[in-house]
C-alpha cells in the first residue's frame, strides 16, 4: 500500500452565481485528516490521530493553502459557460502517492455535477477526458481558462505535484502514520430474522490498516459469498476502520458457526453468542 494524500475540494454555484463558501476534505492514507467547511476556512484535524500527526502547532499553513485552492476553484467554476439554473458543483480531487520503492504518482481530476470530465497526470502533464460531448465541452472550457489564467493560478495548478508530495512527506515525518498496526475489536451479535432463522452479524472496528478478512464459517468451512452480506470497509473517524459481515442461520445451530477474522497476519475466530445473550465482545489474541 503506498502512502497517499488526497485533496477533495468542492465549490457551488446557484443560478450561475458562484457561492462564497467551499468544502475541502483532506485524506491521509485513506483516512479523514483535515476539513474546511465554513465560509471562512479554518483547517480542522479530524480526530486525535490527525492532531498527533500535525503536532502542537497551529494549522495556519494548511488553512492558507486550502483557502487559496478554494478561491482558485471558484474562479474556475465562474468560467464554466454552460451553467444553467439551479445548483451546480465543481469538484477537484488531487491525489499524490509515495510507493514503497520511493516512486511517486500524482493526479488531478475535475467533476462537474458529480461527473468526471477532465483528468491530468501531474507528472507527465498529460490530460485525459471521457468521450461524451458534454465532458469534452467542459474540459475544453476549463483547460482554456487554466491556460489563460496560468499566472493567477500558477501556485495552484503548477506546483501541485511538488506541493502535495512535500506535504505528504512532512506528515509522514511525524511517524504516527508510518505502517502502524492497530488490531480490530470484534463483536458478534444475533437478531431474530424469521421463523426458525436468525441473522448473525460480525463487526470489526478500530483496526488499521484497512485490509481485513472477515467471513462466516460453518464447521470450519467458509460460507459461499452469496450466503453472506458484507459492509464496506469504512473510516470510523479515529484514524482506523470498521466493517461487518452477516449471514442467516437456523436457530439452534449457532454453535456451528464462527466469524473468522484475519488482519495484519493475525487471526481469530469468534463464536455466535447463544441464547438470550445479545452481544459478545472479544479482542483477538
Amino acid at each position: 500500500e503506498p502512502h497517499s494524500l488526497r485533496y477533495n475540494l468542492t465549490v457551488l454555484s446557484w443560478d450561475g452565481s458562484v457561492q462564497s463558501g467551499f468544502l475541502t476534505e483532506v485524506h491521509l492514507d485513506g483516512q479523514p485528516f483535515l476539513r474546511c467547511d465554513r465560509q471562512k476556512c479554518r483547517a480542522k484535524p479530524q480526530g486525535q490521530w490527525a492532531e498527533d500527526v500535525l503536532g502542537n502547532k497551529t494549522w495556519d499553513r494548511e488553512t492558507r493553502d486550502l483557502t487559496g485552492n478554494g478561491k482558485d476553484l471558484r474562479m474556475t467554476l465562474a468560467h464554466i459557460k454552460d451553467q444553467k439554473e439551479g445548483l451546480h458543483s465543481l469538484q477537484e480531487i488531487r491525489v499524490c502517492e509515495i510507493h514503497e520503492d520511493n516512486s511517486t504518482r500524482s493526479s488531478q481530476h475535475f467533476y462537474y455535477d458529480g461527473e468526471l470530465f477532465l483528468s491530468q497526470n501531474l507528472e507527465t502533464k498529460e490530460w485525459t477526458m471521457p468521450q461524451s460531448s458534454r465532458a469534452q465541452t467542459l474540459a475544453m472550457n476549463v483547460r482554456n481558462f487554466l491556460k489563460e489564467d496560468a499566472m493567477k493560478t500558477k501556485t495552484h495548478y503548477h506546483a501541485m505535484h511538488a506541493d502535495c508530495l512535500q506535504e505528504l512527506r512532512r506528515y509522514l515525518k511525524s511517524g504516527v502514520v508510518l505502517r502502524r498496526t492497530v488490531p480490530p475489536m470484534v463483536n458478534v451479535t444475533r437478531s431474530e430474522a424469521s421463523e426458525g432463522n436468525i441473522t448473525v452479524t460480525c463487526r470489526a472496528s478500530g483496526f488499521y490498516p484497512w485490509n481485513i478478512t472477515l467471513s462466516w464459517r460453518q464447521d470450519g468451512v467458509s460460507l459461499s459469498h452469496d450466503t453472506q452480506q458484507w459492509g464496506d470497509v469504512l473510516p470510523d473517524g479515529n484514524g482506523t476502520y470498521q466493517t461487518w459481515v452477516a449471514t442467516r442461520i437456523c436457530q439452534g445451530e449457532e454453535q456451528r458457526f464462527t466469524c473468522y477474522m484475519e488482519h495484519s497476519g493475525n487471526h481469530s475466530t469468534h463464536p455466535v453468542p447463544s441464547g438470550k445473550v445479545l452481544v459478545l465482545q472479544s479482542h483477538w489474541q
Epitope: 464459517r217 460453518q218 464447521d219 470450519g220 468451512v221 467458509s222 460460507l223 459461499s224 450466503t227 445451530e253 454453535q255 456451528r256 473468522y260 484475519e262 497476519g265 487471526h267
Partner: antibody
C-alpha cells in the same frame, strides 16, 4: 454406527458419464455437510467437491469444475456426484466424506470408496 | 491457491521410536489444518483437527502442533499399527488441499 457406502463406480469411456451415490446411515444426514474426495491408483488424496447443509454452499476443485455436479437428497439420506465429460485422469477411487460438526473443515467419517476407471 | 508440502515423503522407523512429520503451507492457514492416517486399501481416518486437537478415539501418542504455515504431527512412541501413510490437509481455503503424504514403514 456411522456408515457411508459409495456406489455407481465402474468402467467408462473418455467423454462418458457416471453418477456416484453415497448412502448414509447412523447419523442425521441433513445436519452434516458432505464431500467427495478421490485417490488415483498409487497416488495421494485429492478433494473433489463440497456441499453444505441445505445445499446453500457448494464448492468444486478446479480440475472438475463445469464437468461434475454435487447434490444431496436429505429425505433419502444420500449424496450424489454426477460426472460428465470424463477424462483418463479422473480414474480413481472416489470416497464420500462427512464434515465434522464444529471442526476445522475436518472430514471425520469416510466411506470405503468406489472405483471409477476411465479408459477406451 | 495454497500449496501443501510434507517432509519427509517417506521414513523408516522402529517400534517405540518417536516420529515427527512436518507439513508446510505456502501461505498462512491459521489453525485450519487436519491430519489423516491411511492404511493400504482402506479409507482415511482423521487423527488431528484444528492443528492440535486430538480426534475422539485416537491414541494420545499422536499429537499435532503449529499455526500459520508450519505444522507438525508427532507420534511419541511408534506402534505396529501406526505403519501407514499420513496426510495433512488445509481447510482454510475452499480448496481443501491435501499434502502429498508421508509413508511410514518398518525399519
Amino acid at each position: 454406527e456411522v456408515q457411508l457406502v459409495e456406489s455407481g463406480g465402474g468402467l467408462v469411456q473418455p467423454g462418458g458419464s457416471l453418477r456416484l451415490s453415497c448412502a448414509a446411515s447412523g447419523f442425521t444426514f441433513s445436519t452434516y455437510s458432505m464431500n467427495w474426495v478421490r485417490q488415483a491408483p498409487g497416488k495421494g488424496l485429492e478433494w473433489v467437491s463440497y456441499i453444505s447443509t441445505r445445499s446453500s454452499t457448494i464448492y468444486y476443485a478446479d480440475s472438475v469444475k463445469g464437468r461434475f455436479t454435487i447434490s444431496r437428497d436429505d429425505a433419502r439420506k444420500s449424496l450424489y456426484l454426477q460426472m460428465n465429460s470424463l477424462r483418463d485422469e479422473d480414474t480413481a477411487v472416489y470416497y464420500c466424506a462427512r464434515v465434522m460438526v464444529r471442526g476445522s473443515g475436518t472430514f471425520d467419517y469416510w466411506g470405503q470408496g468406489t472405483l471409477v476407471t476411465v479408459s477406451s | 491457491d495454497i500449496q501443501m508440502t510434507q517432509s519427509p515423503s517417506s521414513l523408516s522407523a522402529s517400534v517405540g521410536e518417536r516420529v515427527t512429520i512436518t507439513c508446510r503451507a505456502s501461505q498462512s492457514i491459521s489453525y485450519y489444518l487436519n491430519w489423516y492416517q491411511q492404511k493400504p486399501g482402506k479409507d482415511p481416518k482423521v487423527l488431528i483437527f484444528a492443528a492440535s486437537s486430538l480426534q475422539s478415539g485416537v491414541p494420545s501418542r499422536f499429537s499435532g502442533s503449529g499455526s500459520g504455515t508450519d505444522f507438525t504431527l508427532t507420534i511419541s512412541s511408534l506402534q505396529p499399527e501406526d505403519f501407514a501413510t499420513y496426510y495433512c490437509q488445509e481447510s482454510h481455503s475452499i480448496r481443501f488441499t491435501f499434502g502429498p503424504g508421508t509413508k511410514v514403514d518398518i525399519k
